[in-house]
Amino acid sequence: WELTILHTNDVHSRLEQTSEDSSKCVNASRCMGGVARLFTKVQQIRRAEPNVLLLDAGDQYQGTIWFTVYKGAEVAHFMNALRYDAMALGNHEFDNGVEGLIEPLLKEAKFPILSANIKAKGPLASQISGLYLPYKVLPVGDEVVGIVGYTSKETPFLSNPGTNLVFEDEITALQPEVDKLKTLNVNKIIALGHSGFETDKLIAQKVRGVDVVVGGHSNTFLYTGNPPSKEVPAGKYPFIVTSDDGRKVPVVQAYAFGKYLGYLKIEFDERGNVISSHGNPILLNSSIPEDPSIKADINKWRIKLDNYSTQELGKTIVYLDGSSQSCRFRECNMGNLICDAMINNNLRHADEMFWNHVSMCILNGGGIRSPIDERNNGTITWENLAAVLPFGGTFDLVQLKGSTLKKAFEHSVHRYGQSTGEFLQVGGIHVVYDLSRKPGDRVVKLDVLCTKCRVPSYDPLKMDEIYKVILPNFLANGGDGFQMIKDELLRHDSGDQDINVVSTYISKMKVIYPAVEGRIKFS
Amino acid sequence: WELTILHTNDVHSRLEQTSEDSSKCVNASRCMGGVARLFTKVQQIRRAEPNVLLLDAGDQYQGTIWFTVYKGAEVAHFMNALRYDAMALGNHEFDNGVEGLIEPLLKEAKFPILSANIKAKGPLASQISGLYLPYKVLPVGDEVVGIVGYTSKETPFLSNPGTNLVFEDEITALQPEVDKLKTLNVNKIIALGHSGFETDKLIAQKVRGVDVVVGGHSNTFLYTGNPPSKEVPAGKYPFIVTSDDGRKVPVVQAYAFGKYLGYLKIEFDERGNVISSHGNPILLNSSIPEDPSIKADINKWRIKLDNYSTQELGKTIVYLDGSSQSCRFRECNMGNLICDAMINNNLRHADEMFWNHVSMCILNGGGIRSPIDERNNGTITWENLAAVLPFGGTFDLVQLKGSTLKKAFEHSVHRYGQSTGEFLQVGGIHVVYDLSRKPGDRVVKLDVLCTKCRVPSYDPLKMDEIYKVILPNFLANGGDGFQMIKDELLRHDSGDQDINVVSTYISKMKVIYPAVEGRIKFS
């Protein structure tokens, strides 16, 4: 019996087609992805093959102005239109709190939404009961397939699930649900979830009875053969894991941003064992036409976005200096503003010993693309912010050793004075450079804001300590020459859309007046 | 013809009786002021004398939790109950914006509210038209008395009147209104207003046709003979000014906080000239009983306040260190929080050259009386803040020379280490002390945040420059040994209630996490 699994993950509100790098589509003839194009391909496969499932492994939420304005209603609407069969909850589904998940998505989705390792307690337990499920049995042709969901247990540090949801260990939580499916005589089981490729492989290895793992969170690109675009494969598609009980378990993931449609064909025997599996992600490029009726619907929903982007979010009473003359040479108040917003966006219920789980921010000055003039009545709009942060990136959470951070700050000024983008703006960090010293030895002081303290204050960086830092995804991926970050990071979780982080902060503060206050000094 | 003028000014929401220093009443048998006691005395005089006017010279708004909760409704209600004859607008009447003046007070007051030098423009002009008046003609017995109002022209820097009110020079604006009263055959004219004693004396000198000046704003205490309480007279009551056209013009003011009832008897001849004037402020001490019906009404209104003071204003995720072990020895995050709130409360539409009219804050560490523990779910209430700032002071605006500020910072550490209250917490200031140097020469660096700049940044203090600084009224009055501030200040305007400033800031920010960030350093 043959099953076709179509899958997406980490779409991050890319409802419209995008450029090849998943930023805003500029030249339409070369654009990719988007729900209208995805639908064309899905329908084509549904017509051609008998047993097809369309699955999403989480993080539909967060990433473009679509989410900022529609807050998840767009996800429910267009996923319903594409007739998804099931979705697993990702960490970003909690970005607007539990209410922001329940109302727009859980209550409106026509397809089941899954997570076996999220347990509700307190007053929330009865309220959310049945609004998401641990697993779902789907009839496919004359057979049934069980889908069990899972979500990153780091979600409380990555999003805003509140105090009444417990995120259990994935493997511990999945095993009993899979066992339950077996008692229901469901013998073909897919684990669909959002915990990253490493955890996906562990689930394939450890959870007895899971036949296929469809994952997300780590934006992993797998491919067999010559890849069709710029993404470099982290392994073959499917990636085969040998389970502890000796089975070959295919693990798949489809990069991110709706650029590819994962396509996996599985052959099962009559006892539900996987006999063979093969496939590849399908690049959704311009050779696939956008579906006209979905496209028309997108254009209808689009109108509200254009209106939103010119509305006032808040005011500044100071010039927001995002000029390269400032931000690539010294502390600039636009850099301070952005870093302060990044930290503010990452306040999390942490344990009693820590005032917060993270206190530091770094930001390449070259990523700040425009100033904002306060003389336009102080008004700041989404449109203004999009000029400052035009790349549609995210502000991510990484864990780094102190020694890596020291290297990063040396890199920040290794060729100082040439207006290069690697000069770092900061938050929760006080750095002093001595440019008379030789490159690689210019950082003479590096103090960082404590986290394991009740009163935040600055202490010297410790080389062997592990620190959490918020930074642009561009830096986490080694951009602007920060190879040491990419090579040495101990953990990396993708965060919220850059503009969204800053716009939320400005709306919250109403009036802003960031100063140049001595975070970066030269001795 | 004899006229009795009863007057109050700068009552600042002291609706209930207070201690002798105008803070919260503790031992009722020794308390003073309050509207119930004031009413008793006013009624007594009204019964005994034929021609009585009860006037208020502004700044009823702002000062206790009464204003925080009732937002001016309490002013209208109890001034109506006391049957005030007229009120002049003070700067604090604009603290909640023009709307916060119009709705609770201008629309609800049964007595005329006056200001001749405030002119409305734009869309506000028609909206506010007739809601306050430049002058009012009051019938008193068989005569008429004209009252012309005026308001500090500094109001745009002291409060929030918005962009559609123009505050003109008092003398320039008053003269034509007085002339107009003369053409209406009104020959007895009182200027009632809120610009401070210096301006009151100028009005008496310069405005032709003004017979008496009843002032406010500077909390001036005048007294003839032995003063009955702790206030030291700034001159005799009334203070006589010889006008440019040779008349003797009595000028009066009645300290503040409803502690005294100004009492001035004027004798006019038949052509409306002042023949004689005498009187004194009446101390409203416990020898005067509180009126039972007003008191009952106060108690009824009180209930809502007790409820308010235990409600959550916002949250802290850090320990707010207001301990004397910290705040009297080094930078403490409670000091930073309070100073940041003080600056935030003083953002004003200033001119294009200045991002704001003030950027600096100083605060005596001894004025911080309690920490706030974050482990109570992070909750901060008015009650918590009242433990931190229990003295019911205000955060005022002063103008000082750089040299005075330097002296203040030397005083801050002149006897460092003895846990004395004069150690300064700061905002918009970076100070470095060297305690190995001799007292009076310990400040080795003093950088201040620029105001005449589009991007705020720190520059060395200039000795001869004039700076605006926000500080507690306690310091403006030379408390904790800061005699140099009192002696050398170039201007002093009273500001908002200390707790109110901090509570507004916390409510605005929702979640706070002030750090110790290196504003104060020791080399």
Partner: nanobody, 126 residues
Framework: EVQLVESGGGVVQTGGSLRLSCAAS????????MGWFRQAPGKEREFVAA????????QFADSVKGRFTISRDNAKNTVYLQMNSLKPEDTAVYYC???????????????????WGRGTQVTVSS
């Protein structure tokens, strides 16, 4: 909270009729396929009838075909089971069930249904 509440059970004579109702709350009703199952003492729970979310597709167990009809009123968030020509072997506890999803044809499989009511007793006496 997603809840299903059955009503309309009772005792009826052979050949008689009953109409069972099931009210659903907590999730958009048109996103649910609805089914009826029954369980007689000492027996497995068995499929009776089902209706797709749109109401266009229905399924019946062979044993009730021609006697039972299933319908839904989407305005009232309610599904009905009209039972005619009742037989003693129809005696059982009847459960309402809901399947979150939108397929053209509803499923007969117990395992596919995500939400269950508490059941209502139907007794057919001879």
């Amino acid at each position: 909270e997603v809840q299903l509440v059955e009503s309309g059970g009772g005792v009826v004579q052979t050949g008689g009729s009953l109409r069972l109702s099931c009210a659903a709350s907590g999730r958009t009703f048109t996103h649910l396929a609805m089914g009826w199952f029954r369980q007689a003492p000492g027996k497995e729970r068995e499929f009776v009838a089902a209706i797709s979310n749109s109401g266009a597709g229905t399924q019946f167990a062979d044993s009730v075909k021609g006697r039972f009809t299933i319908s839904r009123d989407n305005a009232k968030n309610t599904v009905y089971l009209q039972m005619n020509s009742l037989k003693p072997e129809d005696t059982a506890v009847y459960y309402c069930a809901a399947d979150w999803g939108t397929r053209d044809s509803p499923s007969k499989l117990n395992a596919v249904y995500d939400y269950w009511g508490r059941g209502t007793q139907v007794t057919v006496s001879s």
